[in-house]
Structures are given as C-alpha cells and as structure tokens.
Interface confidence: medium
C-alpha cells in the first residue's frame, strides 16, 4: 500500500494517501534538521539528509538500524536520492556546490559534478534511461540535466525562479517541480519542453512528488500537504493541515522504483561503483581519487597525492587533468590536527592531535585507527604535547618533537617507544624532518632569542648549527632527498627559504604577500605552501619555468600539508635500514659509503655485537 | 562564508529619507531569509522588515508600516530599506540579519550603519 513520506526538522513522518488521517511519526533519534528524503523499496529503508548535523541517514521504516551513512565534507545537502538499481546514494549539497555519488552504505564515496554549480538544491534520478536531473538556486536559477555518471551535462530549463521539488512521473515521462519565486507548480516533458503551468494560484508551494494520477505538494504558507490532478492541476484536497516547515515530502511505493538496467544485476561487474549512463548502458565508476583500470571494471587507489589538514579534518588533494576536487578523508574524532605524516608502504596517515596532546594512525578509509603515542604515561608521571613528526618509512619509526619535555623522541610505527635522541638544557626543537635515505634528521630549535636550524644524525650525534642568522620563527621545515634540499617558513619574517642539505646556498624563494606559513611540503619540481591567515595552498615551480601559482583558497584553520610519492618497492628494499632495521635493535644509520651502523638512543648504550642496546 | 555589509547611514531631519544597503557575499546569498533589525539607544534590538527569497513574503514591524520598504536585488546581493517619513524614535544603529528560511543552522549578522534622526 503506498503511503506519504515527509520530512519536517526533527521528525520524519508518514501518513496515508487519504485525507483526514493521522500522520505517524517514524520513531527515529537524533534526527535535528531533516531536509532531503528518499527510499529504497527494496530493502524497506529511508535515507535522509540533516542539514543541521550535516549528515547523510538512513533507518527501516520501522525506525530500527539507525546509521549515519554520510557524516564528513557536507555542508547543507539539500538534494539526495536513491538510484534503486545500482544501489547507489546521490546528493547535492548547495554549500559545497557538489553533486557526489556513493553506494548505499556510504561507501566509495565520489563527486560527480562539481565545476559550475551554483547552490544545487533539488535532485531526481532516473536510473532506468541513465539520467539525474537537479535544479540550481544560484545567480541564474535553472533546471540541468546529466549522466549518472556526471558526463553529458546541458542545461533544460534555464528560465526558472528557484525550483525545488524536481519530481519525476516515470510512466509518462515528464518532470515537474515547485518555483518559490513565481509560486508556480510546473511541468516539462523529459527534454524541458512542453512546459505547463499545474497550478498558478499557490501561496507558497515547497515540496512536491506524484503517484500515479496525482501530485502532491506541501505549501509553507497554508501548512499543508494537498494534491491535485497531475495534468489539469484540478480536484484539489487538502491532504493535512496544521503543518509547519515540510521540506520534503514523497510516496512510497514500489511502483515509484520500477525499471532494470545493467547495474541492478551484480553491480555490473564493477568493483566499487555502477552508474547508469543514457541509454540503458552504464560505466564502472571508482572512489574519488582512484583510476578506473584498463579492464573498465576495476579501481587502483591513488600512489601519489598531497593530503593537507585543518584543525578537525585531513583532505586528500590529487593533481590531475581532471583538476579533480579534494575530498575529506573520513576519520573520526579530530580535535585540532597540528601535524600530518604518511607511510606509504602500509598506506597509512599519521597526525599529531594537540588537543588530545597524542600521535595516532588510520588507513585513508578511517578504519584501524590505533593510538601510537598517548598523552601521558602515568608510570613516569610524564605528560607530552607532541609538536610535529616525521616518519622514517625504512626503519619504521616515528620521529616527533615534544613541546612540554623539548626533546625528540623516537617512536616505533606500531607504538612501541625507541626512546629519545635529542636533549639538552636550552633545546627547544619543534619541527622535524628525517633524510633516512642519507641517515639524518633536521630540526628548527626556537631556543629563546636564538632561533636556529639544525642537523644531527637519526641518533642524535653529530649535530650541527646549519642557520642561526636572519631567522625569527622557523615554524616548518621540508626535505627532499631527490633535490638534495631542505627548505623552511620562517612565520615571523613571513618567507620561504631553501639551501642544499649542507646549509650551502641558501637562497630566499618567496618573501612577498605570505602571512602566516605554516607547512611546507616538495611535490615533483614545486613546492607548495599553506597560509593560515590567508585560508589558501599555494606552490612555487623550483625551476623556475611556471612561478608562483594559487591551488586553492578559502581554506579555513589550515595547519599542515604534506606531499605522497609513489613508493618505488625496489628502491626500497635496495636501503639497508629497510630489512628488518639493518639487523639493529633501536635504531638503523646509513653511513657515508652505503652501508649501516647501529646505534641507540640516549638512555641506553651500544653493546659489543654492535646491533643490540642495552643499560649503560 | 556569508559575510554582511551594511552602507546608507546617516544623520537626517525628522521627515526625511534614507535608503540604506546591505551588501552580501557568500555563495548562497540568494536563498537565505535578509531582515533589518536596529537597536535603540537603551532598549533591546528589535526586527524592523524581512524579506524572505520568495520575493512575495515581505514583513514589516507595525512602528514601519508605510514608511518603511523593504526590497532586494539577488543578482547584486544586496538588500535595500528605503527608510521614509523618518521619526526621531527611528534613530538606532541599524543591523543587516541573513538567515536560512528552514531552520537555525546559519544566522550572520553585520557590523551596523547608525541612523540618527533628529528633530
């Protein structure tokens, strides 16, 4: 039996098709600003979307199995429906101006449609021809039309107030919607032609849907659910009064998801996303980021990208033809990132939370996240506030800096303490970068009225004073072996500097319009930069061919940005720290001719096997 | 961000007009509710007129009614109050509001104009 759906704030409601019934609210939790609504009849579930929480839900209809499906990078998704063939959650979101795709459980997440959109709102899909249809609110409201797979995109109805309600009358073929500027209820046949007025003497319609020979709408000003008849606009009733504020409304039935295409039959073959293409075909689609490979039905994750983070997320950017959007990586509970780090082996994130004043890690998914260093360690009644770290991926060690016991420490990837290195009276080290690949770690030391940057050995020994002039603040440090340069961002002087990994040629590389840097990574030829205060990502090309260019603005409480190159496995294997750390028991140095040495950190000693540390 | 800027402020003689502007920026300027409120001296803030972005919805406080209009222009993100017929229990600091039709998810606010009007 059909019955109305409807979405109002905190509740989510269904109620019959005749009038003068009781609506039922659907007893679901913490459901605060329900906006956009759809079903899938199959499986007997809703989804919604919160524009409060800004989350993606759903829940059976009986409003058990409550689960947020979506809950990072949503502004206000407004527009979201089911593609009941492909199994498949598409929404748009008018803050992010994106159109994304992902399965119904939320996984495989992608973003479809995202030049040019100007507030996109309402969204219908028709999964049997391979269409979705959404209609934008922006500076020239209008009515577009694409693939389900983002491609083919043209404009249908571009003279249009702010429509909303994009409803689609599968049998005959035609769309209709809601216009809050002309209060018009309108229908166009598939193409946005044939365009007719249903109702003209509305006060203020909002949310629409049909079934069978009837419309049905919501209007915010007389409070209430009606219908009519869907050609003539005629028979009007007055479904229920006393309604405030219905942002969505619509029939559930099945007879409202009926149809076949290739990716209602084992997903199409594809291993992440099906998505319907006109007419009647469809494509293998992959999690943002991924690469469809060469069989057309299989992804590859992304090897080489640039992840960047702001005080409670971390965002993967990749530089692509495509100009491809960044994506929120979803990981739970971030509190104030201040430093990011990947291993690349074990395709893991690492960061620093000063909130929560600990080192943790989770794979790019959010899973298997795991605490590496905690805040504090009762046995020594020692607490720690973690400043900044660098991983060395052969060895397979953490190094990180300490602002409350101002020294380095060295921290195995699996949590398991080294010990530390670096010490001493007047030592303030905050950022640190690791060269495993020559054996040596560099570090910015804000000793006060004498900041400097240093260079000393993975252990600790031979350190050296390579900058101690024409530096106030040295908040950010970067490496790259390849170039053989280090390069650092000085928040006081507000400049970027480089020299060799000696300290030979210094030389200034930008000084002009930089306000607060505050991470610094080497991406192939360019160096790219975050500005907290000016909210954007720049790069500088190091050969000096393309100059300084913006990536991205509008970036709020920007903190640390970090380059991933693919990991060549035969080079790695070829490093002598990278079997099984050289054979030493602490900690692996690569000496000048190639080969290793073993030794220890501070509290312990080198024992006479030359690979073991022991108590002095 | 929705950022809000108001402009048309001033000192004017009792029976006088102003017109004053609320400038925004943001991307989804177009679909939020844009009120004037103003705060008198030594009373509370109080909403004068709004207009919602389905143009035919406009309120207006009863003290304005008639000599107050209110009117936007999308495309220029801007929201005018054409303030007529000015009393002296009109003068206030005059405050742009900008705020989402459905829900208290987003609300901002401008720094101010003040209008003084004196008799």
């Known amino acids: 039996e059909a019955f109305l759906l409807f979405s109002r704030r905190a509740d989510i409601r269904r109620i019959s098709l005749e009038t003068n019934n009781n609506n039922v609210a659907i007893p679901l939790t913490g459901v605060k600003e329900a906006s956009a609504l759809d079903f899938d009849v199959t499986d007997n579930r809703i989804y919604w979307t919160d524009i409060s929480l800004k989350t993606i839900s759903r829940a059976f209809m009986n409003g058990s199995a409550l689960e947020h499906v979506v809950e990072f990078g949503l502004d206000y998704p407004e527009g979201m429906a089911v593609d009941w063939l492909g199994k498949n959650l598409y929404w748009a979101d008018t803050g992010t101006n994106r159109i994304e795709v992902s399965k119904l459980d939320g996984q495989h997440r992608q973003v479809l449609v995202w030049k040019d959109l100007d507030s996109p709102r309402a969204l219908a899909l028709d999964p049997a021809e391979g269409f979705m249809y959404w209609t934008e609110w922006g500076g020239k409201p209008k009515i577009d039309r694409a693939a389900m797979d983002g491609s083919e995109r043209t404009t249908l109805v571009p003279n249009v107030g702010r429509a909303n309600g994009l409803t689609i009358d599968y049998a005959k073929r035609r769309l209709y919607w809601t216009d809050l500027d002309t209060n018009l209820i309108e229908s166009s046949n598939m193409l946005g032609l044939n365009r007719e007025v249903i109702a003209d003497d509305l006060p203020h319609p909002f949310g629409l849907t049909q079934y069978q020979d009837y419309i049905y709408w919501t209007d915010w000003s007389r409070r209430s659910i009606e219908r009519a008849n869907k050609t003539s606009g005629q028979n009007r009733t007055i479904i229920q009064g006393h309604l405030d504020y219905v942002m969505d409304i619509l029939v559930f039935h099945s007879s409202r998801q009926s149809g076949w295409n290739e990716c209602a039959s084992s997903n199409g073959h594809c291993s992440h996303l099906c998505l319907a293409v006109p007419v009647g075909g469809f494509v293998c689609g992959c999690p943002a980021h991924y690469s469809l490979n060469a069989d057309n039905r299989t992804c590859s994750a992304p090897t080489t990208f640039l992840l960047f983070s702001q005080k409670s997320a971390i965002n993967r950017m990749v530089i692509d033809e495509q100009q491809s959007p960044d994506i929120i990586l979803p990981i739970h509970s971030l509190r104030n990132v201040r430093a990011i780090d990947y291993d690349p082996l074990d395709k893991q994130l690492y960061w620093i939370d000063s909130r929560q004043n600990m080192i943790r890690k989770a794979q790019e998914d959010g899973s298997q996240g795991f605490t590496v260093v905690v805040s504090s360690v009762p046995s020594q009644n020692l607490e720690i506030q973690p400043y900044d770290l660098s991983i060395d991926i052969y060895s397979r060690y953490i190094y990180w800096t300490c602002e409350a016991t101002n020294v380095i420490n060295v921290t195995r990837l699996d949590g398991r303490s080294v010990g530390v290195v670096l010490k001493g009276e007047q030592d303030r080290p905050r950022a640190v970068v690791v060269n495993p690949e020559k054996g040596y770690m560099y570090f910015t030391n804000l000793q006060e009225r004498s900041p400097k940057i240093e260079r000393a050995a993975l252990d600790g020994t031979e350190r050296e004073v390579l900058f101690f002039s024409g530096l106030s603040k040295p908040i950010a440090l970067a490496l790259d072996s390849r170039l053989g340069k280090l390069f650092w961002a000085d928040s006081d002087l507000r400049r970027i500097e480089s020299s060799d990994l000696s300290g030979a040629n210094r030389i200034v590389l930008e000084d002009s319009n930089i306000l607060q840097p505050v991470g610094l990574t080497v991406f192939e030829n360019w160096l790219y930069w975050i500005d907290k205060q000016q909210q954007m990502i720049e790069k500088i090309d190091m050969t000096g061919r393309e100059g300084r260019t913006k990536v991205q603005a509008r970036i709020a409480q920007l903190s640390d940005i970090h380059a991933v190159k693919e990991l060549n496995l035969q080079e790695y294997r070829q490093h002598p720290c990278a079997q099984d750390n050289g054979g030493c028991s602490h900690i692996c140095l690569v000496k000048g001719d190639g080969t290793t040495r073993c030794s220890c950190p501070m509290h312990l000693v080198l024992l006479q096997d030359e690979l073991s540390c022991g108590e002095p | 961000d929705v950022q809000l800027v108001e402009s048309g402020g001033g000192l004017v003689q009792a029976g006088g007009s102003l017109r004053l502007a609320c400038a925004g920026s943001g991307r989804i300027f177009a679909i939020y509710d844009i009120a004037w409120y103003r705060h008198p001296p030594g009373n509370q803030r109080e909403l004068v007129a709004m207009i919602r972005p389905v143009v035919t919805e406009i309120d207006y406080a009863d003290s304005v009614k008639g000599r107050f209009t209110i009117s936007r222009n999308n495309a220029m993100k801007t929201v005018y109050l054409q303030m007529n017929n000015l009393k002296p229990e009109d003068t206030a600091v005059y405050y742009c509001?900008?705020?989402?039709?459905?829900?208290?998810?987003?609300?901002?606010w401008g720094q101010g104009t003040q209008v003084t009007v004196s008799s």
């Open positions: 509001n900008a705020k989402r039709p459905w829900g208290s998810a987003d609300e901002y």
